[in-house]
């Protein structure tokens, strides 16, 4: 607390501006305005990321207006230093007290590359495993000292479950953050809306994403399965193809089964849903099988899990490598 | 030119700075410093994108240092106005002359979202039409007054053909720019490298993308075509599926033919190439056909154009809706 017999200074940093095209000048001037204090000795220090700078400052002589004094100190920085996201502080010592203002380059106001996506639960998790989860995915973050916060809420105001978080540095140097939230099967089916809020020091505003059960018409998938004939040079391998089409909405899970056992997802490759010429969607799934498998049991099942399929949200089709045998 | 009997003013805009976290304050102050002029009447006007602003300016009283005078005028803007990328000008009229300085929000220094992609020619254009083109695509540009320049170069140093350019405003407000360059069939096949260079005032540095013929092993595609059986409720429509697989490299063109005529690309939907479990790639293509078509001629052809296919870079497979008839 300052004693009554002096008026403390106001410290405010101004900066040279970009030109009419928004381009940074080659050098940036920071002007520290120390104003409105009772005349007396003041000491001005510039800090870069908290460290005292060894600089030759152009500190203007103090001016006096009435009872109060003002001083200004100017710091010149290279464009490169300014753009490197360091924080600059003008620290004023006066009457045994410290007053300061800090600044850094304004965060990109439109960080286009930072994107957030919120998934719906997979039909398999929702209807078969009965443990649905939703995932909030944030991509193209520039790695920085600031923490990315992903917080969950429900439109109903009810509490959310405990979420799990994962961070991954991508090869292109960006950061990917995911948060996975378990949701109640009944809550989801009854139309609850879930919200994911993303905050980060470099984001000018929070990103909000919400997800809920898809509305609109429902249509069950048609499932067709085919086996490729033998191809020269690959007698011990065949490809099975499954076309799943005309379903609505687009959320679908595809599985392959052999010997009543579900094959690992890594075994098959399934395309993203695409629109048909009509109002529905389609996917293709491809599975490579070996002679050992078809000789053990020559029946493979392609199964689609979809909310409009009945009974029990599944439709399946069997296919054999050698159907005539 | 100013006459000799007065010293003209220097006009410079300073601005309030972002805080130590790089966040914009709720309001932004622009301070126009008009300094070093021979005392006399001056008039200060603020312009927004060239239009005079009807504002209540806090113009400080003029101060005098020795023979010369200085004046300052402050303009307060909402964060929203400042972030909307408008240009602000401080215009000073003095002794019948105009002096000014302009500023706007600094362009994002790390516009991560601006991406450039350079395609290879489609096998169809390369081997069938024999008029290959490559396209440089720039996405996620913020629309602005600056021009995006896309220029072409060849690694061999030889001249490039004339390119065609297209600009498209996307629904999300961003700009997409493409430049399409015709290339010589022989140049491409012999391994020429083409470079696309993207410059823009808001890009801190040029983006460079290059493309050349894919190196590595070659493998011709296997082509399989299937027809779906009749499905209840859709007697007059069938779906044809084509699986094209185990080809290398991934560049492929897929066409459907009926009655020896190539069907428009819009008629079918073909997936992007995906890796097989082995070293090759696969795609699926889906075509919906009508009873009128199959009754006219019940043979549909799925054709793949690929550099490793022989003869003449094509492999095709015929399929019928009712194969037994």
């Amino acid at each position: 607390v300052c004693s009554r017999d002096f008026t403390p200074p106001t410290v405010k940093i101004l900066q040279s501006s970009c030109d009419g095209g928004g381009h940074f000048p080659p050098t940036i001037q920071l002007l520290c305005l120390v104003s409105g204090y009772t005349p007396g000795t003041i000491n001005i220090t510039w800090l870069e990321d908290g460290q005292v700078m060894d600089v030759d400052l152009s500190t203007a002589s103090t001016t006096q207006e009435g009872e109060l004094a003002s001083t200004q100190s100017e710091l010149t920085l290279s464009q490169k230093h300014w753009l490197s996201d360091r924080t600059y502080t003008c620290q004023v010592t006066y009457q045994g007290h410290t007053f300061e203002d800090s600044t850094k380059k304004c965060a990109d106001s439109n960080p286009r590359g930072v994107s957030a996506y919120l998934s719906r639960p997979s039909p398999f998790d929702l209807f078969i495993r009965k443990s649905p989860t939703i995932t909030c995915l944030v991509v193209d973050l520039a790695p920085s000292k600031g923490t990315v916060n992903l917080t969950w809420s429900r439109a109903s105001g009810k509490p959310v479950n405990h979420s799990t978080r994962k961070e991954e540095k991508q090869r292109n140097g960006t950061l990917t953050v995911t948060s996975t939230l378990p949701v109640g099967t009944r809550d989801w089916i009854e139309g609850e809306t879930y919200q994911c809020r993303v905050t980060h020091p470099h984001l000018p505003r929070a990103l909000m994403r919400s997800t809920t059960k898809t509305s609109g018409p429902r249509a069950a998938p048609e499932v067709y399965a085919f086996a490729t004939p033998e191809w020269p040079g690959s007698r011990d391998k065949r490809t099975l193809a499954c076309l799943i089409q005309n379903f609505m909405p687009e959320d679908i899970s595809v599985q392959w089964l052999h010997n009543e056992v579900q094959l690992p997802d890594a075994r098959h490759s399934t395309t993203q849903p695409r629109k048909t010429k009509g109002s529905g969607f389609f996917v293709f799934s491809r599975l490579e099988v070996t002679r050992a498998e078809w000789e053990q049991k020559d029946e493979f099942i392609c199964r689609a899990v979809h909310e409009a399929a009945s009974p029990s949200q599944t439709v399946q089709r069997a296919v054999s490598v050698n159907p005539g045998k | 030119v100013c006459s000799r009997d007065f010293t003209p003013p220097t006009v410079k805009i300073l601005q309030s700075s972002c805080d130590g976290g790089g966040h914009f304050p709720p309001t932004i102050q622009l301070l126009c410093l008009v300094s070093g002029y021979t005392p006399g009447t001056i008039n200060i006007t603020w312009l927004e994108d060239g239009q005079v602003m009807d504002v209540d300016l806090s113009t400080a009283s003029t101060t005098q240092e020795g023979e010369l005078a200085s004046t300052q005028s402050e303009l307060t803007l909402s964060q929203k106005h400042w972030l909307s990328d408008r240009t602000y000008t401080c215009q000073v009229t003095y002794q019948g002359h105009t002096f000014e300085d302009s500023t706007k929000k600094c362009a994002d220094s790390n516009p991560r979202g601006v991406s450039a992609y350079l395609s290879r020619p489609s096998p169809f254009d390369l081997f069938i039409r024999k008029s290959p083109t490559i396209t440089c695509l720039v996405v996620d540009l913020a629309p602005s007054k600056g021009t995006v320049n896309l220029t072409w170069s060849r690694a061999s140093g030889k001249p490039v053909n004339h390119s065609t350019r297209k600009e498209e405003k996307q629904r999300n407000g961003t700009l997409t720019v493409t430049s399409t360059l015709p290339v010589g069939t022989r140049d491409w096949i012999e391994g020429e490298t083409y470079q696309c260079r993207v410059t823009h005032p808001h890009l801190p540095r040029a983006l460079m993308r290059s493309t050349t013929k894919t190196s590595g092993p070659r493998a011709a595609p296997e082509v399989y075509a299937f027809a779906t059986p009749e499905w209840p409720g859709s007697r007059d429509k069938r779906t044809l599926a084509c699986l094209i697989q185990n080809f290398m490299p991934e560049d492929i063109s897929v066409q459907w033919l009926h009655n020896e005529v190539q069907l428009p690309d819009a008629r079918h939907s073909t997936t992007q190439p995906r890796k097989t479990k082995g070293s090759g790639f696969f795609v699926f293509s889906r075509l919906e056909v009508t009873r009128a078509e199959w009754e006219q001629k019940d043979e549909f052809i799925c054709r793949a154009v690929h550099e490793a296919a022989s003869p003449s870079q094509t492999v095709q497979r015929a399929v019928s809706v009712n194969p037994g008839k």
Partner: antibody, heavy 121, light 111 residues
Framework: EVQLVESGGGLVQPGGSLRLSCAVS?????????WEWIRQAPGKGLEWVAS???????NYNPSVKGRITISRDDSKNTFYLQMNSLRAEDTAVYYC??????????????WGQGTLVTVSS | DIQLTQSPSSLSASVGDRVTITCRAS??????????MNWYQQKPGKAPKLLIE???YLRSGVPSRFSGSGSGTDFTLTISSLQPEDFATYYC?????????FGQGTKVEIK
Amino acid sequence: EVQLVESGGGLVQPGGSLRLSCAVSGYSITSGHRWEWIRQAPGKGLEWVASIHYDGSTNYNPSVKGRITISRDDSKNTFYLQMNSLRAEDTAVYYCARATHYFGHHHFAVWGQGTLVTVSS
Amino acid sequence: DIQLTQSPSSLSASVGDRVTITCRASQSVDYHGDSYMNWYQQKPGKAPKLLIEWGSYLRSGVPSRFSGSGSGTDFTLTISSLQPEDFATYYCQQNAEDPYTFGQGTKVEIK
């Protein structure tokens, strides 16, 4: 695939002459690119010497201009470096290279294995 | 001529280390938003191999542990996790203006 093979290096007396060859296979030197000579003195760094463009134009490092000539024989798909008035400081491994062009600028993308020139009495 | 100064001249490091080599040009090698700076790797008795072009573009086939950055006069080559095959001499080279010049080299040795 383009390959470059240098030859013609060896021991030469100060004041003497030498002609280095760079035989190119897999690409015609008149079809495109700039073709370079770069040298490296024993235990030292690299120095660009001279270049010949596919259109026949030539460039030289001022440090060697007047003593060195770059030329080519289209029929043999080979380019050469003729070195006269050789000095001890010309002792180096001489590399030939193919340069990649980018808007009037070039960098050295494909290199030969090098040939050693020793200038000594 | 544009002079290029590399630092350090040599360094000792272990497999897995992050290695940074800097190159300073006597004048800017940037034109129209492009940085005309390249990086080469040379192993004993072999020709140099181009790693990075235009300051930061990784040459096709070069492992992603190599990266280049910088602009104007100051450039950096970084090896994020040094591998046994990375022990070599590294050169920066400017192709902004004739005559094209190289740095004096940085030798990366096994600690």
